[in-house]
């Protein structure tokens, strides 16, 4: 969370941004809020990126002005135009690229004053893992798969019964480059699993942490997955 202040004569406004992460190839949002101003035509929003000449996006007089937009953002950005008057200057970013990572500035000018705040935008790839019972194996084993990760994550297994146990000797993890030659598919197999136990497959890099749980009993298999972005907010 970054709060910036600006001074215009006697007036300043508070601008707030949130560090966030973008998933390569998906659409993302760079969050920015400011003190609302009902005079839409008097609001100017400028998004800038460190090291880039030209603007990422500009919104003024109630509409976009992309005349100064840098080529790398062409056709990829939009503000939530109907939410500008209530203080939302967040930017939608289409088809997030690795090169979109960096420091962005959300600059606001209204009839009340002006202000700005910086935002650290991380880019990578992250996806939910899915665990299945691997019936092809000679012994009962579990297969944890997640289709898209970057940078290369670490993978660890845990179990409810054997808390604190190290499963690295009885698991095998591989990383397979996807067709776009950036992201990778993660596959990890855990061998010699026992029934009536809950196992967790944890995948983590510096952007996200994902966990897949599986409970195998005689009568059923229960699964649960969750994904958490790191250093956000």
């Amino acid at each position: 969370l970054i709060i910036g202040f600006g001074i215009s004569g006697k007036h300043f406004i508070t601008v707030t941004t949130f560090t966030s992460a973008g998933n390569i190839g998906e659409d993302g949002t760079l969050s920015c809020t400011f003190e609302p101003d009902i005079k839409l035509n008097g609001i100017v929003i400028q998004w800038l990126k460190e090291g880039i000449k030209g603007l990422v996006h500009e919104f003024k007089e109630g509409k976009d002005d992309l005349s100064q937009q840098h080529e790398m953002f062409r056709g990829r950005t939009a503000v939530f135009a109907d939410q500008v008057v209530v203080g939302n200057a967040s930017l939608r970013l289409k088809n997030v690229q690795l090169t979109d990572a960096g420091t962005y500035t959300c600059y606001i000018r209204t009839s009340k004053g002006k202000g700005n705040a910086n935002l650290e935008y991380k880019t990578g790839a992250f996806s939910m893992p899915e665990i299945n019972v691997d019936y092809n194996a000679s012994s009962e084993s579990l297969r944890c798969e997640a289709p898209r990760w970057f940078p290369q994550p670490t993978v660890a297994w845990a179990s409810q019964v054997d808390q604190g146990a190290n499963f690295s000797e009885v698991s095998n993890t591989s990383f397979e480059l996807n067709s776009e030659n950036v992201t990778m598919k993660v596959v990890s197999v855990l061998y010699n699993v026992t029934i009536n136990n809950t196992y967790s497959c944890m995948i983590e890099n510096d952007i996200a942490k994902a966990t897949g749980d599986i409970k195998v009993t005689d009568s059923e298999v229960k699964r649960r997955s969750q994904l958490q972005l790191l250093n956000s907010g």
């Epitope: 190839g25 509409k63 976009d64 992309l66 937009q69 056709g75 950005t77 939009a78 289409k94 067709s179």
Partner: antibody
């Protein structure tokens, strides 16, 4: 409501330059949230996106045609234009102009289209 | 560039029946997909954008779904004016590309 109308020669000789103009009425070409695009459709075939332009003059072209395409804009006349050089019979198509959202990048509305035949 | 593949090439349906058209992208386009309708001698008309949002004035019988690489356009009850060619278009990355089209004809 916003309307677009293509105009230009219907017949162009091989190796020459195809030139078309799109006139926008019922709205300003200086609309901040839109690009202005060209799309073509060979007879009986599918659609091919050629490229677009912003009112400030910045352009993006389909790489497959980039070496031959020029799109320009005249805000005073509320028009934008397409030039395609060194044409061959394969460039025979109905050429459409359309308004393109800056994002989401839908195409709406479209002009009625104009058939350009490349033949000697 | 991203290749868009539509199926079937031709769909024969009786008036009042449901039509389901498919569009597949060669790589993920998230939800950055539009559908257009084209009648003979006319320009295409925008039906759906954002994979599932109906454009202004488009009847509720048209609906879009899907994300990533698999998309569907459904016409819940075909009217006589719906017989046409339908195209999908990705606007996820330049150059924007169209599918080859699906012709919906009267059975």
């Amino acid at each position: 409501q916003l309307q677009l109308q293509e105009s230009g020669p219907g017949l162009v000789k091989p190796s020459e330059t195809l030139s078309l103009t799109c006139t926008v009425s019922g709205g300003s070409i200086k609309s901040g949230s839109h690009y202005w695009g060209w799309i073509r459709q060979p007879p009986g075939k599918g659609l091919e996106w050629i490229g677009n332009i912003y009112y400030s003059g910045s352009t993006y072209y389909n790489p497959s045609l980039k070496s031959r395409v020029t799109i320009s804009v005249d805000t005073s006349k509320n028009q934008f234009s397409l030039k395609l050089s060194s044409v061959t019979a394969a460039d025979t198509a109905v050429y459409y102009c359309a308004r393109e959202g800056s994002y989401p990048n839908w195409l709406d509305p479209w002009g009625q289209g104009t058939l350009v035949t490349v033949s000697s | 560039e991203i290749v868009m593949t539509q199926s079937p090439a031709t769909l024969s349906v009786s008036p009042g029946e449901r039509a389901t058209l498919s569009c597949r992208a060669s790589q993920s386009v998230s939800s950055n997909l539009a559908w257009y309708q084209q009648k003979p001698g006319q320009a295409p008309r925008l039906l759906i954008y954002g994979a599932s949002t109906r454009a202004t004035g488009i009847p509720a019988r048209f609906s879009g779904s899907g994300s990533g690489t698999e998309f569907t356009l459904t016409i819940s009850s075909l009217q006589s004016e719906d017989f046409a060619v339908y195209y999908c278009q990705q606007y996820h990355s330049f150059p924007f590309t169209f599918g080859g089209g699906t012709k919906v004809e009267i059975k």
